[in-house]
């Protein structure tokens, strides 16, 4: 079975490779902005979720992690860091999120909004292909 | 620098190893065989950094460490003495080791637990 490789390349040291993406799963806590800056310094971005089972490889993690979602007053919508809009199917509860807050997510598929100044763990993501 | 990986689809890569993240439960011996059938080995812990990473993403898993009895030392399936501390339970018959979010613990080899496999690149 080990011969059946995926077509994508592997990730930098201390990053997790899964389904052609690389993830940096922090063990230290930062504010949302500090987390965003750290991910950017790695030429990556805070986690942008494609679907709710994207993190099923770490489904046992107890922690909530900052992800790359913030409210745009200009667009009156929740946007990912690259400017794309949040799918309403990803977080059914997103209408209750306070626009001033930032979003933390756990690998069981739960999201919550918290003050962006709260220190949380965070996940950076790079797409390989 | 990036090197092209050699992990099967649906496995994860981390620091030059591939990991199979199991969802199914097996006894320790069954887990050993299940990993062998995937051309890999039951999860091993090489250092503190790897243990910190694994405990961040996994709830629990059998690891490749056991002992013949409570009077024997903990060894890996390769026969090497295991260096890390394994927290003992009160039960003498708990002779297989597992990784838990709070560290390494002894458990009953015949009980069914989640298992994960590892293959070094």
């Amino acid at each position: 079975e080990l011969q059946k490789d995926s077509d994508c390349c592997s990730c930098h040291e201390k990053w997790v490779g899964y389904r052609c993406n690389c993830y940096f799963i922090s063990s230290e806590e930062k504010t949302w902005n500090e987390s965003r800056h750290f991910c950017a310094s790695q030429k990556s971005s805070l986690l942008q979720l494609q679907n709710r089972d994207e993190l099923d490889f770490m489904s046992s993690s107890q922690h909530f992690y900052w992800i790359g979602l913030s409210y745009s007053e200009e667009h009156t919508a929740w946007l990912w860091e690259n400017g794309s809009a949040l799918s309403q199917y990803l977080f059914p509860s997103f209408e209750t999120f306070k626009p001033k807050n930032c979003i933390a997510y756990n690998s069981k598929g739960n999201a919550l909004d918290e003050s962006c100044e709260t220190k949380n763990r965070y996940i950076c993501k790079q797409q390989l292909i | 620098a990036r090197h092209c990986g050699h992990c099967p689809e649906e496995w994860i890569t981390y620091s030059n190893s591939c990991y199979y993240i199991g969802k199914e439960k097996r006894t320790w011996a069954e887990s050993l065989l299940a990993c062998t059938s995937k051309n890999s080995s039951l999860l091993s812990i090489d250092n503190e950094e790897e243990m910190k990473f694994l405990t961040a993403i996994l709830t629990s898993s059998w690891i490749d460490v056991f002992r013949d009895s409570s009077h024997h030392p903990w060894v890996t399936i390769n026969g090497l003495t295991f260096k890390h501390e394994i927290k003992e339970s009160d039960h003498a018959e708990h002779n297989c080791a597992m990784l838990h979010v709070r560290g390494l613990f002894s458990d009953e080899c015949g009980s069914s637990k989640i298992y994960h496999c590892k293959h070094k690149l």
């Epitope: 040291e13 800056h37 950017a40 310094s41 | -």
Partner: antibody
Amino acid sequence: QLVESGGGLVQPGGSLRLACAASGFTFSNYAMNWVRQAPGKGLEWVSVISGSGDTTYCADSVKGRFTISRDNSKNTLHLQLNSLRAEDTAVYYCAKNCYGSGSYYNHFDYWGQGTLVTVSS
Amino acid sequence: EIVMTQSPDSLAVSLGERATINCKSSQSVLYSSNRMNYLAWYQQKPGQPPNLLIYWASTRESGVPDRFSGSGSGTDFTLTISSLQAEDVAVYYCQQYYSIPLTFGGGTKVEIK
């Protein structure tokens, strides 16, 4: 804190070895840089080395002549300058990347005071 | 490599007045996946090493007075000193850290008029 040493007067074609002693942060966690400044001129990035020391990059102007290295056990960064030319005359600063892990896409949050290298016959 | 061009080369401003320095990159330093601009500003006083003022184009470094601000995106950036103080006399450099080799602008000397 970063403190450079090893500068001085050297003839064209000669060699020097600069050192930068680091303290106050976990040295091995950060990529480190050398930046130089010719008298009365602007800043020029010279070289970077990863935290582990296994990856380096150099500016084209010094490639093949300058070598960056580090000794994490001594918290020291080095720059070996060979085949020196008059245009290498400058103050050489070591500078710390702001963010840890395997990144070179950083601004510099700490700089040393610099050491002057003069290449003249 | 990305060439950074600063203007003006020098600038004389009265105390309390606004000073504006421009920096243009030969290619965009905006990364599309995170919409971050990989640009920093440094201040260098005579006989001293550079000192970080602004990073990610607009984030002020801790301890830097709020009269310093950075703006711009893509290829065009500005450092503004809203009310020039005597201690702001220095040379100011922009730097891109989007790609290696990392490159600096040629510097802008700010003086009191």
